[in-house]
């Protein structure tokens, strides 16, 4: 913490300007009025403050706004945003997409994924839902940031907005997020024809249940291997060799090079070896011919 001193009369600050870069930390602390700083935040980013000086300015704002900064200040934080922790950001109430854009631009190229995730979360809370304008802003200024939101926040996405989401925006989404987004996407694209539907739904398929995957296998979609391997393990395991063959089409050949990776490995172990042999890939590890498969989980459920 910066020690308190009184401000020398000749150092008194009446406006935020370039002369402040020559102030020592303790002089900034003593001479800059927090209310003046807040009122003239739009000037701060144009001044080449050191990181140490920015620490002092942040300290000033923290004292003035212990419950969190108002949006008028947040919008103009500029490089001061780089000093914020997720805990700081959690106190904010942000509704303006201009504020979001400004801060996303500042954070670019810096290791701030936790701060950005918290900021986006605050915007969604502030706006009440993840609307189309917010999604458009995220996809334009922060590809992949959509996946930083919790499944609970993503549940506020109306299906009508799903069309604005691009495949690359979902690259970092986990299974729980795709579980939330997939039903919305299914609803959003339900009136599309077979091939057009598959192109649109493909990035969301990591949330698809087995019955939907089975249905896709009847539609000649030729799913690529990367998409197949993003499917839920529980959705893949019940598929038969014939269904996987139909689902992947020519890409089924790639199972050979991915046989050690989940869910391919787990799926192979559940297939009959003679069925696997029909794939013409030399896949090994299936259930030997003549063996009987007992599902003990069913017996346990009955006892």
């Amino acid at each position: 913490d910066v020690e308190r001193t009184t401000c020398p009369p000749e150092k008194e600050v009446h406006e935020i300007d370039e002369s402040l870069i020559f102030y020592k930390k303790r002089e900034l602390e003593a001479c800059v009025d927090a209310a003046l700083l807040a009122a003239q935040m739009d000037r701060v980013d144009a001044i080449p403050f050191t990181y140490e000086q920015l620490d002092v300015l942040k300290h000033k704002l923290d004292e003035l706004y212990p419950q969190g900064y108002p949006e008028s200040v947040i919008r103009h934080l500029g490089h001061l945003f780089l000093k914020m922790s997720p805990e700081d950001i959690r106190k904010w109430n942000v509704t303006s997409l201009e504020t979001l854009k400004a801060l996303l631009k500042v954070s670019k190229g810096h290791e701030m994924s936790a701060q950005v995730a918290t900021l986006i979360d605050r915007v969604v809370v502030g706006r009440g839902q993840l609307d189309k304008d917010t999604v458009d802003t995220l996809t334009a200024f922060c590809p992949g940031c959509l996946c930083s939101l919790s499944p609970e926040r993503l549940s506020s996405v109306p299906p009508s907005v799903i069309g604005a989401v691009r495949p690359q925006d979902l690259d970092t989404c986990g299974p729980r997020q795709l579980d939330v987004l997939y039903p919305k996407a299914r609803l959003a694209f339900q009136n599309m024809s077979g091939s057009e539907y598959f192109v649109k739904i493909r990035p969301f398929l990591g949330g698809a249940p087995t019955e939907d995957v089975k249905a896709l296998s009847q539609q000649n979609v030729s799913m690529d291997l990367a998409t197949f391997m993003k499917l839920r393990r529980e959705a893949v395991l019940p598929l038969t060799v014939a269904e996987v063959q139909k689902l992947l089409g020519p890409h089924v050949e790639g199972l050979k090079v991915e046989e050690q990776h989940s869910p391919v490995r787990d799926w192979i172990l559940k297939q009959r070896q003679d069925d696997l042999d029909t794939l013409g890939l030399g896949l090994q590890g299936g259930i030997p011919n003549g063996y009987l498969i007992l599902d003990l989980s069913v017996r346990e459920a009955l006892s």
Epitope: D171, A226, V257, G280
Partner: antibody, heavy 115, light 113 residues
Framework: QVQLQQPGTELVTPGASVKLSCKAS????????MHWVKQRPGQGLEWIGN????????FYNEKFKNKATLTVDKSSSTAYMQLSSLTSEDSAVYYC????????WGQGTTLTVSS | DIVMTQSPSSLAVSVGQKVTMSCKSS????????????LAWYQQKPGQSPKLLVY???TKDSGVPDRFIGSGSGTDFTLTINSVQAEDLADYFC?????????FGGGTKLEIK
């Protein structure tokens, strides 16, 4: 060692059909799919399609769907590609190649379509 | 279809020099589940059939000399030949096997000065 043997040349007249062969040896024929690739003089490579020798399933590049027909004879470990309604545009070197990685290639058959 | 773009189309170097060629794809070739890029490099010497050099963007096929190095991920890939030898005179093609139709780049012709 793995070998894919293809005849060196085929000379056919426009409008005719031709059946190119690719005899595999040195590995289990039904454990790798066979691919066919076209290369015109001084030009790049084009994937025509592939076939699963185990069950005969075929997949084609849309561009060659009405031009090429892929088959296999498991008993002789030979893959075939029939090309129909030949024109001068079909004059090229045709290669067979093994598996998803195309890790082994035949020497190629030079097809000349000329009257 | 995925478009594969190679550059330069040709280059001439002296024996012992290092050479770099580029291959760009119109969409990502990365399978994020297995962290494999579905990209291969082939060498085609004059009058011969193509030969697999590198697969998964950076894995050398058996018997390929150490001077051949594949690198890159997503959409941008590079084949580097450290200390070019006279026998490296050939066309070099990249190819994606992410999705059908599998497509090749136009090739880079390597000439020896």
């Amino acid at each position: 060692q793995v070998q894919l043997q293809q005849p060196g040349t085929e000379l056919v007249t426009p409008g005719a059909s031709v059946k190119l062969s690719c005899k595999a040896s040195g590995y289990s024929f039904t454990s790798y799919w066979m691919h066919w690739v076209k290369q015109r003089p001084g030009q790049g490579l084009e994937w025509i399609g592939n076939i699963n020798p185990s069950n005969g399933d075929t997949f084609y590049n849309e561009k060659f769907k009405n031009k090429a027909t892929l088959t296999v004879d498991k008993s002789s470990s030979t893959a075939y590609m029939q090309l129909s309604s030949l024109t001068s545009e079909d004059s090229a070197v045709y290669y067979c190649a093994r598996g998803w990685l195309r890790d082994y290639w035949g020497q190629g058959t030079t097809l000349t379509v000329s009257s | 279809d995925i478009v594969m773009t190679q550059s330069p189309s040709s280059l001439a170097v002296s024996v012992g020099q290092k050479v770099t060629m580029s291959c760009k794809s119109s969409q990502s070739l990365l399978n994020s589940s297995s962290q494999k890029n579905y990209l291969a490099w082939y060498q085609q010497k004059p009058g011969q059939s193509p030969k697999l050099l590198v697969y998964f963007a950076s894995t050398k096929d058996s018997g390929v000399p150490d001077r051949f190095i594949g690198s890159g991920s997503g959409t941008d890939f590079t084949l580097t030949i450290n200390s070019v030898q006279a026998e490296d005179l050939a066309d070099y093609f990249c190819q994606q096997h992410y999705t059908t139709p599998y497509t090749f780049g136009g090739g880079t012709k390597l000439e020896i000065k």
